[in-house]
Amino acid sequence: EEELQVIQPDKSVLVAAGETATLRCTATSLIPVGPIQWFRGAGPGRELIYNQKEGHFPRVTTVSDLTKRNNMDFSIRIGNITPADAGTYYCVKFRKGSPDDVEFKSGAGTELSVRAKPS
């Protein structure tokens, strides 16, 4: 079996303030089992945007039904975008762990740019 890759096909996305941003991410394998998380930024200071396993993320919805059998689409939509949302977003696959899941592989990132609303 080929090792899982995390594909973020869009290097950059431009969204108008107030609109919804779609950040695309797919995995190439069902193995290993484990959740996806989305972060803005990289390194220890990165900001968690969405965690499939747990948490409440009112601005975020998933594009696909995560409970759909054999789902490998982990794209998200972020609503009501503001200039503060600009940055690079990473889709990160975690491997089921005991007691905690372990980061397995990250996508290359998608840079979100926000176009100001015309006044």
């Epitope: 069902l30 089992v33 499939q52 396993k53 747990e54 995560l66 409970t67 054999n70 789902n71 089921k96």
Partner: antibody, heavy 119, light 110 residues
């Protein structure tokens, strides 16, 4: 840490119904299937049914389709399995189990609920 | 429905020796390049524990003396060097269709 806490042991008369609960914690309840499996004393595992808490989609083992009903309460992250028209051969330990990979498998299990059917 | 048949029903193996349990499906459990077979271990008074998923992938925290192999209709769970704590009943499960379990194999120490 994923936990599935089941309700306590039950003793029922033939013809009665039983409703077993399974309270989930440590993860987003609506993102993962819940399975129900039973095990009669000294016997093997028998799959009953599964439910997707996000939309209440269910799949049943044909053997139980007419007697079992799965439900969930997303406000309390609790799954329920009701079995009607109980017979002595329904005496078993009933387990709930969570499917962490949408593979129709059982990654995390409750401790089980013993249901005894006796006149 | 897919029927899973395990063999043998019971098995006695010496400590440190290899234990092999087989699971045969009544039709193929393969789809889209994956084999939808899972292996569980159950010790007395405990719920089952997932060992292997998609035929050959070790679940988190499972010792690497356990391994799974096979494709199509024939699958094997192998314990390379039996330890005392491996005494249990082992079940295969398929999910190519809706889940079904094999009848179980009881593993004891010789």
């Amino acid at each position: 840490q994923v936990q599935l806490v089941q309700s306590g042991a039950e003793v029922k008369k033939p013809g009665a119904s039983v409703k077993v609960s399974c309270k989930a914690s440590g993860y987003t309840f609506t993102n993962y299937w819940i399975n129900w499996v039973r095990q009669a004393p000294g016997q093997g595992l028998e799959w009953i049914a599964m439910i997707d808490p996000s939309d209440s989609e269910t799949h049943y083992n044909q053997i139980f389709k007419d007697r079992a009903t799965l439900t969930t309460d997303t406000s309390t992250s609790t799954a329920y399995m009701e079995l009607r028209s109980l017979r002595s051969d329904d005496t078993a330990v009933y387990y709930c189990a969570m499917d962490y990979g949408s593979l129709y498998a059982m990654d995390y299990w409750g401790r089980g609920t013993l249901v005894t059917v006796s006149s | 429905d897919i029927v899973l048949t395990q063999s043998p029903d019971s098995l006695a193996v010496s400590l440190g020796e290899r234990a092999t349990i087989n699971c045969r499906a009544s039709k193929s459990v393969s789809s889209s390049g994956y084999n939808y077979i899972f292996w569980y271990q159950q010790k007395p008074g405990q719920p089952p524990k997932l060992l292997i998923y998609l035929a050959s992938n070790l679940d988190s925290g499972v010792p690497d003396r356990f391994s799974g192999s096979g494709s199509g209709t024939d699958f094997t769970l192998t314990i390379s060097s039996l330890q005392a704590e491996d005494v249990a009943v082992y079940y295969c499960q398929e999910s190519r269709e809706l889940p079904t379990f094999g009848q179980g194999t009881k593993l004891e120490i010789k």
